[in-house]
Interface confidence: low
Amino acid sequence: QRVPKEGQTFFQKPESCPSVPEGSLKLDLGIINANQRVPLSRNIERRSTSPWNYTVTWDPNRYPSEVVQAQCRHLGCVNAQGKEDIFMNSVPIQQETLVLRRKHQGCSVSFQLEKLLVTVGCTCVKPLIHHVH
């Protein structure tokens, strides 16, 4: 049995409610805490030893329509002198998330969950070295 966290409620459906087809739900696209912003460290994507660029991708048939993706700038990492060190690797940090895909069927519109791989930034790692015996 799962116990609700403080301030959280598990809703019990009243007996009188009509049944809903399995796997479907009513969706309110309003966002709770819509103005909450991630407190990003300033220019972290430029100051990193594995710097990256951001691209805002836009898809009108996806919710959210706007998704920010990062791309590593270099194959190697940047040293203290600002030179690329090819003996280290810049690699993307990726997060699998769920978005809603808008589907049009005749006059009706529905949404389906879709997995999206979001690159949130890059990190510097030691390269994989394959030892030949």
Partner: nanobody, 122 residues
């Protein structure tokens, strides 16, 4: 590289209105913003809008008077300025952003236009 060209500035009396436009070359869905710089002052944030146009943010000093909007089909950003005051006098710039974090931080904008001068005076 995105090129931005602002237009629509000019001389207007207090209480008057102006509509600024910013034409962007090259299709962009980046978030965009309007910033301004008054003589002898630093650039300050005015308003910002998400790539889709769904989210907008305003500086407290312009809230309720200015409206930011965009037309992605025309690659154009707009700033409708009503009830103008003498303290709104400044060079207005449009610029792109990577996202809507810290919209008020002028250092986080890139691809600035050359600016358009707005003078509010009687």
């Amino acid at each position: 590289e995105v090129q931005l060209v602002e237009s629509g500035g000019g001389l207007v009396q207090p209480g008057g209105s102006l509509r600024l436009s910013c034409a962007a070359s090259g299709r962009t869905y980046d978030a965009m913003g309007w910033l301004r710089q008054a003589p002898g002052k630093e650039r300050e944030f005015v308003a910002a809008i998400s790539g889709s146009g769904d989210d907008t943010y305003y500086a407290d000093s312009v809230k309720g008077r200015f409206t930011i909007s965009r037309d992605n089909s025309k690659n154009t950003l707009y700033l409708q300025m009503n009830s103008l005051r003498p303290e709104d006098t400044a060079v207005y710039y449009c610029a792109t952003r990577r996202g809507l974090y810290y919209v008020w931080d002028a250092n986080d904008y890139e691809n600035w236009g050359q600016g358009t001068l707005v003078t509010v005076s009687s």
